[in-house]
Interface confidence: low
């Protein structure tokens, strides 16, 4: 009796299952009690000798390429051997590499975690993922794993991490790069500083007083609100960052505490209060303002 080994599929792709079947065309295996064993090159596969004429291999990899055969043994210890069958496992080259961010959109708060997720739409076997910073490509990290995605984590984002990033995936057919992804690091405003600017050392009634508010840190645009006591005087925007000013024509009622607030949508911060008092210097006829 002749023995044949049949692999299904006969040309497997990496990562896919394969069923090996030991066939006896002119003899039903039920006619006699047989034990079966499957081999690759010189090594027995799976459980060794078994009553099943089939062997299921859950996933085939490139390194599983080789020469396979089977043997059948009767109760009378007669051993039948099949011819060798060459099984070539095909690797799928990586394709369609993309870089995504968590949080999505590439906008991240300073101090928060940023994850750069490199993905391939297809590709089998060990895939090497590499992450690069900047268009010139400062190498950040590489990972090799049997998966279609890999992650690079920046546990606590700093201002200096605001850059363009890309990743490259490779599984033996040459590197395949993703597109560039821009990371914007959003910085909450720092506590603003309120400065008072007058046309002369001692401002008088009817002078124009400039209230200048500036947060030294914070992503633009920044909206500044100006307050006299707890009354809102008005607001000014700084679309590109920096400070903003509010002009006030002085009257005697303008004594009191002044403050400002900076808000860039990531949080608001209020300045320390600055106190203005009208004084009447000895021998002077006009009221003067001091801070």
């Amino acid at each position: 009796a002749e023995l044949f080994l049949i692999a299904s599929p006969s040309h497997p792709t990496e990562g896919s299952p394969v069923t090996l079947t030991c066939k006896m065309p002119f003899l039903q295996s039920s006619d006699a009690q047989f034990q079966f064993c499957f081999f690759r090159d010189t090594r027995a596969l799976g459980p060794g000798w078994s009553s099943s004429p089939k062997l299921q291999i859950a996933a085939m990899w490139k390194e599983d390429t080789g020469s396979y055969w089977c043997e059948a043994q009767t109760m009378a210890s007669k051993v039948l051997r099949s011819r060798r069958s060459q099984i070539n496992v095909h690797r799928v080259p990586v394709a369609d590499v993309s870089l995504e961010t968590q949080p999505p959109g590439g906008q991240v708060m300073e101090g928060d975690r940023l994850v750069l997720i490199c993905s391939v739409a297809m590709g089998t076997g060990d895939i090497t993922f590499l992450w690069y910073k900047g268009a010139v490509g400062l190498n950040l990290q590489s990972k090799t794993q049997r998966s279609l995605t890999a992650e690079y984590e920046i546990p606590s984002v700093r201002e200096s991490d605001a850059e363009q990033y890309y990743c490259v995936a490779e599984n033996g057919y040459g590197p395949s790069p993703s597109g560039l992804v821009s990371i914007t690091v959003r910085i909450p405003v720092s506590r603003p500083i309120l400065m008072l600017r007058a046309p002369r050392a001692q401002a008088a009634v009817e002078d124009v007083l400039e209230l200048h508010c500036e947060a030294l840190r914070g992503s633009p645009p920044i909206l500044y609100w100006f307050y006299h006591e707890d009354i809102t005087l008005g607001s000014r925007s700084a679309p590109s960052g920096g400070g903003a000013s509010f002009n006030l024509s002085l009257t005697e009622e303008h004594s009191g505490n002044y403050s400002c607030e900076a808000n860039n949508g990531l949080g608001a911060q209020r300045s320390e209060a600055v106190t203005l008092n009208f004084t009447v210097p000895t021998g002077a006829r006009s009221n003067h303002l001091t801070s």
Epitope: M109, G111, R113, L138, I154, P155, S156, R158, S160, D161
Partner: antibody, heavy 117, light 112 residues
């Protein structure tokens, strides 16, 4: 101001489990990872794991993977750590700690767990 | 895991003296993307929780007196107390956060 409130002590029997709490206040709870650290009497500090209060995703020190389970309740701004199959080796002070810029900037007062029959 | 080694394990100094303690990591804590060292120093006084002193190896935490200074890069780090006060009696731990956090075994500072 930022505060992490933990109960002072728990006395538990061997083989049982205990759920430790950590109530956060004074900041946006979901913006910062919460870590847990173990300190046995007279010993150093040992990292147990961390949880992202926003997603609930957690990572553990391999040594504590089958010992500790981290959870959060966003509505009450609380983090929890359940310790199971307690033995005398688990007798320690357990701290919850907030992480900012990678470092642990605020710590709870710690909960002292005593495992005794 | 990254192993953190601290030395000495304890030291006794007089008030006003300068103190340095060392921390070494089994691999570099310098992060190429931002040129920061992922190392922190903590102070734990008797019966209290640890308190953050220094992060990014050399950035002093808000409210920490300027007599505490962190220095070093890569694998070798130092915490210096320029003029010890009696209230500095504590155990000092270094910790890396380049990977899952690990702590050194601590340096116990005693006052003579």
């Amino acid at each position: 101001q930022v505060q992490l409130q933990q109960p002072g002590a728990e006395l538990v029997k061997p083989g049982t489990s205990v759920k430790l709490s950590c109530k956060a206040s004074g900041y946006t709870f979901t913006r910062y990872w919460m870590h847990w650290v173990k300190q046995r009497p007279g010993q150093g500090l040992e990292w147990i794991g961390r949880i992202d209060p926003n997603s609930g995703g957690s990572k553990y020190n391999e040594k504590f993977k089958s010992k500790a389970t981290l959870t959060v309740d966003k509505t009450s701004s609380s983090a929890y750590m359940q310790l199971n199959s307690l033995t005398s080796e688990d007798s320690a002070v357990y701290y919850c700690t907030r992480v900012n810029s990678g470092a642990m900037d605020y710590w709870g007062q710690g909960t002292s767990v005593t495992v005794s029959s | 895991d990254i192993v953190m080694s601290q030395s000495p394990s304890s030291l006794a100094v007089s008030v006003g003296e300068k103190v340095t303690m060392s921390c070494k990591s089994s691999q570099s804590l310098l992060y190429s993307s931002n040129q920061k060292n992922y190392l922190a120093w903590y102070q734990q006084k008797p019966g209290q929780s640890p308190k953050l002193l220094i992060y990014w190896a050399s950035t002093r935490e808000s409210g920490v007196p300027d007599r505490f200074t962190g220095s070093g890069s890569g694998t070798d780090f130092t915490l210096t107390i320029s003029s010890v006060k009696a209230e500095d009696l504590a155990i000092y731990y270094c910790q890396q956060y380049s990977n899952y956090p690990t702590f050194g075994s601590g340096t116990k500072l005693e006052i003579k």
